[in-house]
Interface confidence: low
C-alpha cells in the first residue's frame, strides 16, 4: 500500500480578526495507526494548537467527525480569529509508539494571515491655542491592522493637506500594526469653524475608511480688534465712549476701563454677538460726566482676553471743548475712530 | 449614481500602442479594485488587470503581463490601461468593472465573497494592418 | 490557476422552463463566486454573488448556489427577456484582484 500522505492543500488563507479560520488536512491512508496533531510553528519551539486524543483547546472545533473509524479529514477550525494568531500551522501525524508517540509525517503547512480592522483613528492637537498666522502640529494615530498596506491622508475644510510625515510600526513582520501621523497646519482667522480631518483607508475598509476629526475651535485664539469712539452726547455734560471689541475667540474676556490711567471700572464679557465665521463681538461703554474734569481725559479701554497679556487703545477727550461742539464733530457710531494705538 | 465611462479604443497597427481611460462618478475609486475585461468578438468574457490605487496594487492576466500597464489617477478619478506591442489578439470591446464586496468572508477559504457590480459601456479596440 | 468550467456550452429552452447552468472549479475555492447576463452589444449585468446571495435589483426567478467545487445558476421559469448569455466568475485572491471567467452559455429560443 502507498505510503501515508499529509495533505494540506491550502498553503496560505488569510481571515479577518473575529472570523473563524479553517485548516484542512487530510490523510491517504489509515495506516500506520496513530493520531493526529497540529501545531503551529515547526521545530523544537512549536505550540500545540489541537491534540486529538487529549487536552482542552476550547477555541477549535473539528470539521469532521474524528470517532468515525475510516476518518481522513483532520480538518481543524479555529474560531475568534485574532492578529496573534497568525502564523504557519502544521498538521502532524504521529505513529503509534509505546510509551510515546514518535511523529510520523507532517503536512507542507498552511500560512494563516490575519486581517484587522484598524483602529478609530483619534486626532489631537497642540496642548496650548495658537493665534492666525501661526502653524501648529495635529497627530492621528490608529492601531491593530494587519496587512500592514494602509494610506492616510490629512484635510483641512475638505481639502487634502500636503504637509505630513507618517510612519507604520513595527517596520518589520508583525501580527499588527500603528500609523503614526503628524500634520502641520498653518491657522486664519477663518478657522473657528475649521476641522483637521484624519483618513484611513485599509483593505479591510473597503470603500468606507475611517475619520478622526478635531475642531480647530479647541486649538486656535483669534485675539480681538479694538475700536473706542466718542459718541454723540446725551447730557449736556455727559460724553458716551464705547469701546468696541471685534472678532475674538474664544469667548472668555475681561474689559477694563481706565481715567487718565486709573481704573474706573471692570467687567467680563457677556451677552456676546456671534459672527458667521464663529468670532464674537462685544461693545462697553463708559459715561463720562465731563463737568467734572478739570483736564483733558485720557480714557483707555484695556482688554485681557483668553489670560493673554492686555491690549488697548485709547481716546483723549478734550475737556476744553464745550462739549455739544465736540459731539457734533463727531460721526455717530463706530464708523469713526478717534482712537490712538498705544 | 456609480457610472464608468471608458474611452481611448480605436484602430491601431500590430506593435501600436493604445491608452484607454475609465472615468469613474459615483463612487471614490481609492477605496475599490477597478477591473479591466475584454471580450474578443463572439468570444467570452477575459480577464485582463485590476488596481487598488490606495495601495498600489496592480495585477495582471498572464496573456497581457509585460506589456499592459494599469493605473489610476485618484484626483480625476479616472483609471487606466495602457497598451504597448498591441497584437491582432489584443482586438476585443474592453470594459472596466468595480470589484465590490459586501462586508461578507469566507474565513474557510480566506476570501472576501465579491463581485464585479458595476461596468462601464465598453470600448473596442481593433488591431489590424 | 483555478479554471471555471461552465456546461453546457448553450442550450434551448422554452419560455416557463426551469434551466440551470453550472460552473466547475479546478480546485476547491471559496464562494466568491458571481453569475452574470450578457445581451449582445450591452456590458455584462451582475445577478449573483457570494454563490448564492441575489444582487438588488434582479428577479427572484435567478438564484445560485454551492455544491463543493460546483456552482450552480437556476432560472426557475424562463421569461422572454433572459434569452442571453450567462457568465461564472471566481474571484481568485483574497481581496478580488484576480478574476477568471467560465466560458458562458448561451440561451437560445427553442
Known amino acids: 500500500e502507498e505510503e501515508l500522505q499529509v495533505i494540506q492543500p491550502d498553503k496560505s488563507i488569510s481571515v479577518a480578526a473575529g472570523e473563524s479560520a479553517t485548516l484542512h488536512c487530510t490523510v491517504t491512508s489509515l495506516i500506520p495507526v496513530g493520531p493526529i496533531q497540529w501545531f503551529r510553528g515547526a521545530g523544537p519551539g512549536r505550540e500545540l494548537i489541537y491534540n486529538q486524543k487529549e487536552g482542552h483547546f476550547p477555541r477549535v472545533t473539528t470539521v469532521s467527525d474524528l470517532t468515525k473509524r475510516n476518518n481522513m479529514d483532520f480538518s481543524i477550525r479555529i474560531s475568534n480569529i485574532t492578529p496573534a494568531d497568525a502564523g504557519t500551522y502544521y498538521c502532524v501525524k504521529f505513529r503509534k509508539g509505546s510509551p510515546d508517540h514518535v511523529e510520523f509525517k507532517s503536512g507542507a503547512g498552511t500560512e494563516l494571515s490575519v486581517r484587522a480592522k484598524p483602529s478609530a483613528p483619534v486626532v489631537s492637537g497642540p496642548a496650548a491655542r495658537a493665534t492666525p498666522q501661526h502653524t501648529v502640529s495635529f497627530t492621528c494615530e490608529s492601531h491593530g491592522f494587519s496587512p500592514r498596506d494602509i494610506t492616510l491622508k490629512w484635510f483641512k475644510n475638505g481639502n487634502e493637506l500636503s504637509d505630513f510625515q507618517t510612519n507604520v510600526d513595527p517596520a518589520g513582520d508583525s501580527v499588527s500594526y500603528s500609523i503614526h501621523s503628524t500634520a502641520k497646519v498653518v491657522l486664519t482667522r477663518e478657522d473657528v469653524h475649521s476641522q483637521v480631518i484624519c483618513e484611513v483607508a485599509h483593505v479591510t475598509l473597503q470603500g468606507d475608511p475611517l475619520r478622526g476629526t478635531a475642531n480647530l475651535s479647541e486649538t486656535i485664539r483669534v485675539p480681538p480688534t479694538l475700536e473706542v469712539t466718542q459718541q454723540p452726547v446725551r447730557a449736556e455734560n455727559q460724553v458716551n465712549v464705547t469701546c468696541q471689541v471685534r472678532k475674538f475667540y474664544p469667548q472668555r474676556l475681561q474689559l477694563t476701563w481706565l481715567e487718565n490711567g486709573n481704573v474706573s471700572r471692570t467687567e467680563t464679557a457677556s451677552t456676546l454677538t456671534e459672527n458667521k465665521d464663529g468670532t464674537y463681538n462685544w461693545m462697553s461703554w463708559l459715561l463720562v460726566n465731563v463737568s467734572a474734569h478739570r483736564d483733558d481725559v485720557k480714557l483707555t479701554c484695556q482688554v485681557e482676553h483668553d489670560g493673554q497679556p492686555a491690549v488697548s487703545k485709547s481716546h483723549d477727550l478734550k475737556v476744553s471743548a464745550h462739549p455739544k461742539e465736540q459731539g457734533s464733530n463727531t460721526a455717530p457710531g463706530p464708523a469713526l475712530a478717534s482712537a490712538a494705538p498705544l | 449614481e456609480v457610472q464608468l465611462v471608458e474611452s481611448g479604443g480605436g484602430l491601431v497597427q500590430p506593435g501600436g500602442s493604445l491608452r484607454l481611460s475609465c472615468a469613474a462618478s459615483?463612487?471614490?475609486?481609492?477605496?475599490?479594485?477597478i477591473h479591466w475585461v475584454r471580450q474578443a468578438p463572439g468570444k467570452g468574457l477575459e480577464w485582463v488587470a485590476s488596481?487598488?490605487?490606495?495601495?498600489?496594487?496592480?495585477y495582471y492576466a498572464d496573456s497581457v503581463k509585460g506589456r499592459f500597464t494599469i493605473s489610476a489617477d485618484t484626483s480625476k478619478n479616472t483609471a487606466y490601461l495602457q497598451m504597448n506591442s498591441l497584437r491582432a489578439e489584443d482586438t476585443a470591446v474592453y470594459y472596466c468593472?468595480?470589484?465590490?464586496?459586501?462586508?461578507?468572508?469566507?474565513?474557510?477559504?480566506?476570501?472576501?465573497?465579491?463581485?464585479?457590480?458595476?461596468w462601464g459601456q465598453g470600448t473596442l479596440v481593433t488591431v489590424s494592418s | 490557476d483555478i479554471q471555471m468550467t461552465q456546461s453546457p456550452s448553450s442550450l434551448s429552452a422554452s419560455v416557463g422552463d426551469r434551466v440551470t447552468i453550472t460552473c466547475r472549479a479546478s480546485q476547491s475555492v471559496s464562494s466568491a463566486v458571481a453569475w452574470y447576463q450578457q445581451k449582445p452589444g450591452k456590458a455584462p449585468k451582475l445577478l449573483i454573488y457570494?454563490?448564492?446571495s441575489l444582487y438588488s435589483g434582479v428577479p427572484s426567478r435567478f438564484s445560485g448556489s454551492r455544491s463543493g467545487t460546483d456552482f450552480t445558476l437556476t432560472i426557475s421559469s424562463l421569461q422572454p427577456e433572459d434569452f442571453a448569455t450567462y457568465y461564472c466568475?471566481?474571484?481568485?485572491?483574497?481581496?478580488?484582484?484576480?478574476?477568471?471567467f467560465g466560458q458562458g452559455t448561451k440561451v437560445e429560443i427553442k
Open positions: 457570494s454563490a448564492s
Open positions: 468593472a468595480r470589484f465590490t464586496f459586501p462586508g461578507l468572508f469566507d474565513g474557510f477559504f480566506g476570501a472576501y465573497l465579491g463581485s464585479l457590480d458595476y
Open positions: 459615483g463612487f471614490n475609486i481609492s477605496y475599490y479594485f
Open positions: 488596481v487598488y490605487s490606495s495601495f498600489g496594487y496592480t
Open positions: 466568475q471566481q474571484a481568485v485572491n483574497w481581496v478580488g484582484a484576480l478574476v477568471t
